[in-house]
C-alpha cells in the first residue's frame, strides 16, 4: 500500500496472507471457514495461509496449508478479466474475534462510495519496502466512465476502480488479491494498476466481487 496508514489492530479479521514458504505472495479474504477469496493471478501450486494477525510472519497467527484452488473458468492471462479465485483450506479455520469471514455483497456499491483497501504489499515503488504491519488506504469508488479515461480498453466490464483524486495512495506489489471493503462488505479484490505504483490519478483496479457472488457460492458448494 502506497501512502497508506497502519490499519487499526484487529479491524480486518477477514484479511489473510498467502505465503510461499515464509514469503508474502498475495493477500486474500476469508469468506468461509474453509475458503479464501483472492485474485486468479495469485495462483500457485500450494499456499501457506496466515490468518488472525496484523503482523506478517506472526508466530502466534493461525497458519493453514491449502493445496486446492479454483480459478474462475473465464480468467484470461491476456486481458486479465475474471481475475478471481477461491482457495480451499486443507482444514477449517478456528473462528474468533481475530478471525472472521467477510460479508459478501448484496449489491454493487455506486461510484463515490468510501472504501478501505488493505495489504502487506510494498509501501514504496519501484524500490520495494515490505511492512510487517497490515497497511490500509481509504479510497473512493470511481465510475467506469471516469476510469476508462485512464485505462481505455484495458478496463473490463467486471473491473472496478478506486482511488483519490491527485493522491498517490494506492495498492502495489504484494497487495494483489486483498480486500477492498465498502460499507462492511467485500466489493473488490486487488487486481492491477500502473507501475511504478502510486502515480496520482491512475486508479487502482479491482475485480468487482458483487458480479461474482453466484460463482463464489456455487464453487464453494460444488467443492465442499
Amino acid at each position: 500500500i502506497i501512502d497508506g496508514y497502519k490499519c487499526k489492530e484487529g479491524s480486518h479479521p477477514w484479511q489473510v496472507a498467502l505465503l510461499k514458504g515464509n514469503q508474502l505472495h498475495c493477500g486474500g479474504v476469508l469468506v468461509d471457514k474453509y475458503w479464501v477469496l483472492t485474485a486468479a493471478h495469485c495462483k500457485m501450486g500450494q499456499y501457506q495461509v496466515q490468518l488472525g494477525s496484523d503482523k506478517i510472519g506472526d508466530q502466534s497467527a493461525q497458519k493453514i496449508k491449502a493445496t486446492k484452488s479454483f480459478r474462475h473458468p473465464g480468467y484470461s492471462t491476456k486481458t486479465h478479466v475474471n481475475d478471481i479465485m477461491l482457495v480451499r483450506l486443507d482444514e477449517p479455520v478456528k473462528m474468533s474475534s481475530k478471525v472472521e469471514a467477510v460479508q459478501l455483497p448484496e449489491h454493487c456499491e455506486p461510484p463515490g462510495t468510501s472504501c478501505t483497501v488493505s495489504g502487506w504489499g510494498t509501501t514504496t515503488s519501484p524500490d520495494v519496502t515490505f511492512p510487517s504491519d497490515l497497511m490500509c488506504s481509504d479510497v473512493k469508488l470511481i465510475s467506469s466512465r471516469e476510469c476508462k479515461k485512464v485505462y481505455k480498453d484495458l478496463l473490463g466490464k467486471t473491473m472496478l476502480c478506486a482511488g483519490i483524486p491527485d493522491s498517490k495512495t494506492n495498492t502495489c506489489n504484494g497487495d494483489s488479491g486483498g480486500p477492498l471493503v465498502c460499507n462492511d462488505t467485500l466489493q473488490g479484490l486487488v487486481s492491477w494498476g500502473t507501475y511504478p505504483c502510486g502515480q496520482p490519478n491512475d486508479p487502482g483496479v479491482y475485480t468487482q466481487v458483487c458480479k461474482y457472488k453466484r460463482w463464489v457460492m456455487e464453487t464453494m458448494k460444488t467443492h465442499r
Epitope: K78, T194, C197
Partner: antibody, heavy 122, light 108 residues
Framework: QVQLVQSGAEVKKPGASVKVSCKAS????????IHWVRQAPGQGLEWMGS????????NYAQKLQGRVTMTTDTSTSTAYMELRSLRSDDTAVYYC???????????????WGQGTMVTVSS | DIQMTQSPSSLSASVGDRVTITCRAS??????LNWYQQKPGKAPKLLIY???SLQSGVPSRFSGSGSGTDFTLTISSLQPEDFATYYC??????????FGGGTKVEIK
C-alpha cells in the same frame, strides 16, 4: 545485485532442440514475469512469449506456438525456454527479460539477461 | 496485433545535435509505450517508460512524449555514448508485446 544470467552459446543442427536458461538473483523471482525476446543477426527485437514464475501461466507468440515451451524452477530462481524443430532462421541472440508491474499487469522490461547466441547450421 | 512503426530506420548526426525519433502505433495505445537503447553486442536497456517517464539512472538529455498513436524520443544534445540503436515497444494490448523496427543513430 539484481541480475538475470543466461546460459552460454549453442550450435545446433536443423531439426534439433535448444534449451536456454536464465537465472535470476537479487529480487523475488516469483513476483515478476519472465519474457523471452530474440534478435536475428542485424535484425530487430521479436517477442517470443512470457511465463509467470509463480503460477506457470504462459503466453506464446502465435508464430512459435507448438515449437516453444517456457518453464520455471522456483527452487533455483531459473527460467527456461526450449525451442524445438530448429530452422536456420531461428539463428539469433535469445534474451530473457523481467517485466515490471504489479498484480495482473506488466508495463515494461526493466531488466535483461546478457543474451545467448543460438546458431542453427547443418 | 498492434504494429509499431519507427522512423527513420537510421540517421546520421553529430555530437551536440538534437535528435528526434518517432514511433507510430497502428491503433491507440494510450501512453503505454517504452523506449530502449541497444549497443552492439549488448542487451537492450530501458530509457523511457509510459511514453514520458525517465528510467532511474538515465541522463536527462533523453525525453519522451506523445500519446495515442504518435510518440517521440528526443535526445537534446547527442553524446558520443548515445550512438546506438533505439527501439520502442507497446505494453498496451498484450500479448503479444510488439517492438518497432529500430532506429540506428550513427556518427556523421
Amino acid at each position: 545485485q539484481v541480475q538475470l544470467v543466461q546460459s552460454g552459446a549453442e550450435v545446433k543442427k536443423p531439426g534439433a532442440s535448444v534449451k536456454v536458461s536464465c537465472k535470476a538473483s537479487g529480487y523475488t523471482f516469483t513476483s515478476e514475469g519472465i519474457h523471452w525476446v530474440r534478435q536475428a543477426p542485424g535484425q530487430g527485437l521479436e517477442w517470443m512469449g512470457s511465463i509467470s514464475a509463480s503460477s506457470g501461466d504462459t503466453n506464446y507468440a502465435q508464430k512459435l506456438q507448438g515449437r516453444v515451451t517456457m518453464t520455471t524452477d522456483t527452487s533455483t530462481s531459473t527460467a527456461y525456454m526450449e525451442l524445438r524443430s530448429l530452422r536456420s532462421d531461428d539463428t539469433a541472440v535469445y534474451y530473457c527479460a523481467r517485466a515490471a508491474g504489479y498484480g495482473a499487469r506488466s508495463w515494461y522490461f526493466d531488466l535483461w539477461g546478457q543474451g545467448t547466441m543460438v546458431t542453427v547450421s547443418s | 496485433d498492434i504494429q509499431m512503426t519507427q522512423s527513420p530506420s537510421s540517421l546520421s548526426a553529430s555530437v551536440g545535435d538534437r535528435v528526434t525519433i518517432t514511433c507510430r502505433a497502428s491503433q491507440s495505445i494510450s501512453s503505454y509505450l517504452n523506449w530502449y537503447q541497444q549497443k552492439p553486442g549488448k542487451a537492450p536497456k530501458l530509457l523511457i517508460y509510459g511514453a514520458s517517464s525517465l528510467q532511474s539512472g538515465v541522463p536527462s538529455r533523453f525525453s519522451g512524449s506523445g500519446s495515442g498513436t504518435d510518440f517521440t524520443l528526443t535526445i537534446s544534445s547527442l553524446q558520443p555514448e548515445d550512438f546506438a540503436t533505439y527501439y520502442c515497444d507497446q505494453f498496451y494490448s498484450t500479448p503479444p508485446i510488439t517492438f518497432g523496427g529500430g532506429t540506428k543513430v550513427e556518427i556523421k
